[in-house]
């Protein structure tokens, strides 16, 4: 029998209730954000609650519906896109998800001038990607891995590429590994600023090994899904970049952009493309061994109709202590002079900061500095640079927006957000209109999220766009857990942690502890953000203490912490979770016989290794969709941190860092292993191999698979998953149902 102290203190507390699992699974306490769809310096579009597309003019205060919900409904549209000349809107329907970012859809073009859908030369279906030119109403789209161009929506299409082939050649869209691990987009084509040129990537996957898995569906025979997927050390996609003149596309056709010689000498990646002007483009390349990145600025040569990338315009970024960049190599933000740019990279103290590059990287001027990191450059105007950082009050898990003056007066730095709603808002992002005339701030917490509109000159708040009043009211009678963010200093390492405590937390009592871990390179779990989720429920209703710890390998605290895991994945991330648990036990309120750990994806890998660490600290744990061996994961991600699985490189650590190698150590813990059978990202193979090793070692464990589910375990699987994990933990912690 578990005796709980009754909570009859006062009438107000009597009306309060704990969170339920149902609350979480129903999304009862989810929040809304408001990101304006900017269409000029002072105008934005927004989809109203009743699905009308409304244009707002900040300066006149007027708004009007440009597209009715009736029109949207007539084609079952779930998304839209206004052409820059405001003559047409594309309507997107029949959304069909592919991978993380990619999906196919059916597109209809609506003519705003006559209030009718464009008939004749309709778009084929399904389309893999479609976008307007930045000026006018040209259309570029990808269909069956080939790129097409329309000068006007009603015109016949001009076919730009002809070699596109499913799973072989991808034009204008990334293959699996580029989508997931390099570009983080569904597209691989880029219009020049005025729509004169269209740049695109071609990915050749002909020689890439294929991952094949069964999709069971409802048919008599399962289907086999085949994806060209380069695992660590395997053959990679071959990438080429082309640019075509969209005014006269047939004149010279696509022109290939040359790869810098120092990059082309061995396997390489293309990492991003940034247009500077209509006739200047910036490409970023990366060696397969990802510690050397080259930024190449290329100019259009009118006489030859080719693109020239002089060596004098190649800028090399190299890391001697780890890989280049953070998670990705940062992208440049160009100045109005169209040659100098701003970029975030490590300074000499090993902190990522904004640098201004005018001629060479060696002569870069560092414009932010300190033992904190600049995280994102949002916008550069003639007189201001807006960026986010975690400088304020030395909390790495915060994000504030800053403005640096770069005009004709001494450079000065101002924190735009630090004191706006200091208790409620410590984690911001921003969205800027043209020329940063106005901007929206979106605050994610730690209080209830709020989105506001601001004047870009004075930073004055103009109006609240979304304040989540309904959520605030709904939470009034909920006993939310308490959260605290603090740090542990251990052997010259700072371990930041977030602790989620039961509402009636009493330091003199003992509580079960659940560690939630991700821990992947360049990740951050300890953030000052609002969330009412599964772990909130576990603290609120089930009386658990939950802790999240950012150990070595995590981001935004300098290269020493970040690159500590370079070529050694699975060692320090685990050690630091264990160290933190020991420190939590010392705090006196943790029941050391009831400690669990759980994680998903990389977190599943870390939780598995922690359970198999032989420390005896953990009673039980859960791994959802874990990596089990780095030889099974994608080349681009894995090799960035681990090098190659070859004898002369890092094969030994690839072998030493598997979960299977520690099968014996699971004997004294309760282990729940969970995976979706249709996981395109961390293949089911990973869990299959763990299970096989445990069986071979005659170690008992629990497992759950989710048929035909991918890495996200969405839909009804989510409900089943969290219900199942809840039962497992309650059983482990001897909590009554």
């Amino acid at each position: 029998i578990v005796l709980r102290p009754s909570r009859v203190h006062n009438s107000e507390e009597n009306t309060m209730r704990a969170l339920t699992l149902k609350d979480i699974l129903n999304g009862t306490f989810s929040y809304k954000t408001f990101f304006p769809n900017w269409i000029s310096g002072q105008e934005y579009l927004h989809q109203s609650a009743d699905n009308n597309i409304v244009l707002y003019n900040i300066e006149t205060g007027q708004s009007y519906t440009i597209l009715s919900n009736r029109t949207m409904k007539s084609v079952n549209a779930s998304n839209y896109g206004l052409s820059p000349d405001r003559q047409f809107v594309y309507l997107e329907s029949d959304y069909s998800k592919l991978w993380r970012y990619s999906y196919t859809a059916t597109y209809y073009i609506y003519d705003l001038s006559n209030g009718e859908f464009v008939r004749g030369n309709e778009l084929p279906r399904p389309i893999q990607y479609l976008c307007w030119s930045p000026v006018g109403s040209k259309l570029a789209y990808v269909y069956q891995n080939n790129i097409y161009l329309k000068q006007r929506p009603g015109d016949p299409p001009f076919q730009i590429t002809f070699n596109g082939r499913e799973n072989k050649i991808f034009n204008g869209i990334p293959d699996w590994v580029y989508e997931e691990e390099m570009l983080a987009t569904k597209y691989a084509l880029w219009w020049s600023p005025n729509g004169k040129f269209l740049a695109y990537a071609e990915f050749n996957d002909t020689d890439i090994p294929v991952i094949a898995y069964s999709y069971y569906g409802d048919e008599q025979y399962p289907r086999t899904i085949n994806i060209p997927y380069p695992k660590a050390g395997a053959k990679n996609p071959v990438v080429r970049i082309f640019i075509i003149d969209t005014t006269y596309p047939a004149y010279v056709g696509p022109q290939e952009v040359p790869v810098p010689a120092m990059i082309a000498s061995s396997d390489y990646y293309f990492s991003w493309l940034t247009w500077v002007t209509d006739e200047r483009v910036c490409l970023q390349w990366l060696k397969r061994v990802q510690n050397v990145s080259v930024l190449s600025i290329c100019d259009f040569r009118e006489d030859w109709q080719t693109w020239d990338c002089p060596k004098t315009q190649e800028h090399i970024e190299e890391s001697r202590t780890g890989w280049a960049g953070g998670f990705f190599v940062s992208t440049p933000v160009f100045s109005y002079d169209a040659i100098s740019y701003y970029k975030i990279f490590s300074d000499k103290d090993g902190y990522k900061h904004i640098h201004y590059i005018k001629d060479t990287v060696e002569n870069a001027i560092q414009i932010t500095s300190g033992k904190w990191e600049a995280i994102n450059i949002f916008r550069v105007t003639q007189d201001s640079l807006f960026y986010s950082s975690n400088e304020f009050e030395e909390y790495p898990g915060r994000r504030n927006i800053y403005r640096i003056s770069i005009g004709s007066y001494p450079p000065s730095k101002k924190c735009v957000t630090c004191h706006l709603r200091k208790e409620r808002c410590q984690y911001y992002t921003a969205s800027f209109s043209d020329y940063a005339k106005y901007y929206a701030l979106v605050c994610y917490g730690p209080g209830i999220p709020i989105s506001t509109l601001h004047d870009g000159r004075t930073d004055q708040e103009i109006k609240i766009l979304e304040e989540n009043k309904e959520l605030e009211n709904a939470l009034k009678n909920i006993q939310l857990p308490k959260e605290e963010i603090k740090k542990l200093e251990v052997d010259e390492i700072t371990l930041w942690y977030k602790m989620i405590l039961p509402p009636q937390f009493d330091r003199s009592k003992k509580y079960p502890l659940l560690i939630q871990v991700y821990g992947g390179p360049c990740s951050q779990s300890v953030r000052s953000v609002f969330a009412v989720n599964w772990i909130s429920y576990l603290a609120s209703k089930e009386g658990m203490v939950i802790a999240l710890v950012d150990g070595r390998g995590t981001a935004f605290q300098g290269d020493k912490l970040l690159y500590a895991v370079y070529r050694k994945l699975g060692v320090y991330e685990v050690e630091d979770q264990i160290t933190a648990v020991r420190k939590f036990i010392e705090m006196g309120f943790i029941d050391e016989k009831r400690i669990a750990i759980w994680g998903w994806s990389y977190g599943g890998y870390v939780s598995s290794l922690a359970l198999a660490s032989g420390t005896g600290l953990f009673k039980c744990g859960i791994a959802v969709a874990p990596v089990s061996s780095w030889e099974y994961y994608a080349s681009v991600y894995t090799e960035r941190f681990m090098g190659l699985p070859t004898k002369d490189d890092n094969l030994e650590h690839y072998k030493n860092s598997t979960v299977m190698a520690r099968a014996e150590y699971f004997r004294n813990v309760d282990y729940l292993l969970i995976h979706g059978t249709a996981d395109d990202n961390v293949h089911f193979q990973n869990s299959a191999q763990i299970a096989k090793a445990l069986v071979n070692a005659q170690v008992d464990f629990q497992a759950m698979w989710y048929s035909d589910q991918n890495h996200g375990l969405s839909g009804l699987s989510t409900n089943h998953l969290y219900t199942h994990m809840t039962h497992f933990l309650k059983q482990c912690f001897s909590l009554s149902d």
Partner: antibody, heavy 121, light 107 residues
Framework: QVQLQQPGAELVKPGASVKLSCKAS????????LHWVKQRPGQGLEWIGE????????NFSEKFEIKATLTVDSSSNTAFMQLSRLTSEDSAVYYC??????????????WGAGTTVTVSS | QIVLTQSPALMSASPGEKVTMTCTAS?????MYWYQQKPRSSPKPWIF???NLASGVPARFSGRGSGTSFSLTISSMEAEDAATYYC??????????FGSGTKLEIK
């Protein structure tokens, strides 16, 4: 090369005025703002004020608003600072210095050798 | 106006020794600038925008800091580094203010 030339010394009586010169060479004086800095013997640096030679606009430290007058003669590529009603407190080395205000620089990149002003009866 | 306090006022270091001097602002400043001055010479620009070395400044020098606390560090002292170092800020501009200086001597 770029230089700012200042006379080595000026001896003046208490209560009198002195006009210090600063001749720019190697560049056009109207291209950069000029600042004046005071340094008393064995002491630190003290900013007096600045002039924009292109339009004559100036800023002063409050302390020197009445004491100093800044002018420029662009035809001779020379800047001047007049100090009035001198006392022994004004005995110091006076530097003229050019401000490099190119993007993200904003520092005094070229300094004159300084003029030693001695106020003595 | 913003007051800059430099410490120590006087320090000495042996060749090869690491040297750090600080500059504390009375209220938060955006950036710090440093100048080197040797006896009977004009000041020279040394560090700008907190952490950037002016042209010709040896790489053993570095600057860091933010808010109200800034420092100049010499990783390995050399005889030619003996001088007085002044910090300067623009944040209250006008006026511009300088620190009172740190005199660095060689042992």
């Amino acid at each position: 090369q770029v230089q700012l030339q200042q006379p080595g010394a000026e001896l003046v009586k208490p209560g009198a005025s002195v006009k210090l010169s600063c001749k720019a060479s190697g560049y056009t004086i109207t291209s950069y703002s000029l600042h004046w800095v005071k340094q008393r013997p064995g002491q630190g640096l003290e900013w007096i004020g600045e002039i924009n030679p292109a339009n004559g606009d100036h800023n002063f430290s409050e302390k020197f608003e009445i004491k100093a007058t800044l002018t420029v003669d662009s035809s001779s590529n020379t800047a001047f600072m007049q100090l009035s009603r001198l006392t022994s407190e004004d005995s110091a080395v006076y530097y003229c210095t050019r401000l490099d205000d190119s993007r993200f620089h904003w520092y005094f990149d070229v300094w004159g050798a300084g003029t030693t002003v001695t106020v003595s009866s | 106006q913003i007051v800059l306090t430099q410490s120590p006022a006087l320090m000495s270091a042996s060749p090869g020794e690491k040297v750090t001097m600080t500059c504390t602002a009375s209220s938060s400043v955006s950036y710090m600038y440093w100048y080197q001055q040797k006896p009977r010479s004009s000041p020279k620009p040394w560090i700008f925008l907190t952490s950037n070395l002016a042209s010709g400044v040896p790489a053993r020098f570095s600057g860091r800091g933010s808010g109200t606390s800034f420092s100049l560090t010499i990783s390995s002292m050399e005889a030619e580094d003996a001088a007085t170092y002044y910090c300067q800020q623009w944040s209250g501009y006008p006026p511009i203010t300088f620190g009172s200086g740190t005199k660095l001597e060689i042992k």
